[in-house]
Amino acid sequence: HLIVTPAGAGEQNMIGMTPTVIAVHYLDQTEQWEKFGIEKRQEALELIKKGYTQQLAFKQPSSAYAAFNNRPPSTWLTAYVVKVFSLAANLIAIDSHVLCGAVKWLILEKQKPDGVFQEDGPVIHQEMIGGFRNAKEADVSLTAFVLIALQEARDICEGQVNSLPGSINKAGEYIEASYMNLQRPYTVAIAGYALALMNKLEEPYLGKFLNTAKDRNRWEEPDQQLYNVEATSYALLALLLLKDFDSVPPVVRWLNEQRYYGGGYGSTQATFMVFQALAQYQTDVPDHKDLNMDVSFHLPSR
């Protein structure tokens, strides 16, 4: 059910493209295509190409994206396009000018002098933005989200966007300055991963990051399963970057025992992050027999 045909406008198309990109990434990283049939990979890649082509129809002259061409461009959506396209660039041919044009727009048009990224065109499909939907600490969570997207595009865009390293540093400094006052476990997790990507998740931020975990295995807010899966996935990625392999197993087991395999309303971010994190886990911790994920992928019928 994760491999679906993308369709719809600028936001819906990304909702549809997400699970297929992350499913192919996960199966590539974990070398599990034999289970599903290697020929399915090519079919999935065709769907990703279709999603990519369709998304270009919603690229505005500024290289930013919105649900419709007559709407103001969205910082969050543009950063998400950067994130998904950066991952898809390992799978299909992505025009680097398209990707890096979006990166340039984020930096030049949406980053304030203090490093914060601002949103002037909120997405219509609020269910696709995951834990960021809770408006509390929105400046930090949006800045962390964009910073992570910029880091993921860095290899492709550094040569084309001279201001990229400076932009990343500025955003990182803002997150550092805000981190100790954060209250939402979701923000602590996403911002913690952003800092980890910059090798800055160290004391006192590291203590705050680890102590925010409930029972040392999850970054949780009451009655928010999807947000908690998303947040804990960010935290797992941070722990893997830190090479804190002693703290990782209970986090992986918690994610695994949620029996969350993606799909469904409001699942875009949780799906993307849980499979990105578990793929990274299985790459970084090769003896991963303790991850007993019963994952199934179904291609759409023609």
Epitope: K214, D215, E220, P249, R253, D287, K289, D290
Partner: antibody, heavy 120, light 108 residues
């Protein structure tokens, strides 16, 4: 930090029974709690555990007949149904070491145990 | 078949000697293993968690190690107060978790 089990007694087969673990010196809103039992002269047997949010995890053999629940910030119950003579044992509660998953970080401290005797 | 196979069921050692207890997991459990000491009439006491980490207040003569799916508790320089039954607890998943059968250690 200390724990104490209560509610153990002599019951007849088929009778339901609820044991209570009362903690002092810490709050269950930040700690995990496990239940383990030990039949007379036998080894330890893991039953299950509850996390600080109230989610429960059970050994496969215990599912359905045993229910762990948090009844306050200082008490956790173990409800047992359809008791048989095989359930005669001392029942222990134990906190997750350092507030973590007790199956990974270990169980510490433990209560002294409460004896349940099932006999007709 | 159980999750954990513990050997031996009993052993003895002289004061100052070494005791070695093993637990074999039925499949990979990585670091999901802890060791407990229990004396008659008392609850168990945590000795080792995460396969090799010493619990707070436990003497350094207790040492946990792992090789593949075999886990070892070694007590070097055994003291009289170490006479007890020792158990391992291994976990494949939350619903597939079990103690070993126990090892009774006698000090001569």
């Amino acid at each position: 930090q200390s724990l104490e089990e209560s509610g153990g007694r002599l019951v007849t087969p088929g009778t339901p029974l609820t044991l209570t673990c009362t903690v002092s010196g810490f709050s269950l809103s930040r700690y995990t709690m496990a239940w383990v039992r030990q039949a007379p002269g036998k080894g330890l047997e893991y039953i299950g555990w509850i996390d600080s949010s109230g989610s429960t995890y059970y050994a496969s053999w215990a599912k359905g007949r045993f229910t762990i629940s948090k009844t306050s910030s200082t008490t956790v119950d173990l409800k047992m149904t359809s008791l048989t003579t095989e359930d005669t044992a001392t029942y222990f509660c134990a906190s997750g070491n350092d507030g973590g998953d007790p199956l990974y970080y270990g169980m510490d401290p433990w209560g002294p145990g409460t004896l349940v005797t099932v006999s007709s | 078949d159980g999750v954990m196979t513990q050997t031996p069921s009993s052993t003895s050692a002289a004061v100052g000697g070494t005791v070695t207890i093993k637990c074999q997991a039925s499949q990979s459990i990585r670091s999901w293993l802890s060791w407990y000491q229990q004396k008659p009439g008392q609850p168990p006491k945590l000795l080792i968690y995460e396969a090799s980490k010493l619990a707070s207040g436990v003497p350094s003569r207790f040492k946990g190690s792992r090789s593949g799916t075999e886990y070892t508790l070694a007590i070097s320089g055994v003291q009289r107060e170490d006479a007890a039954t020792y158990y391992c607890l291994g976990s494949i998943a939350s619903d597939d978790t079990a103690f070993g059968a126990g090892t009774n250690v006698e000090i001569k």
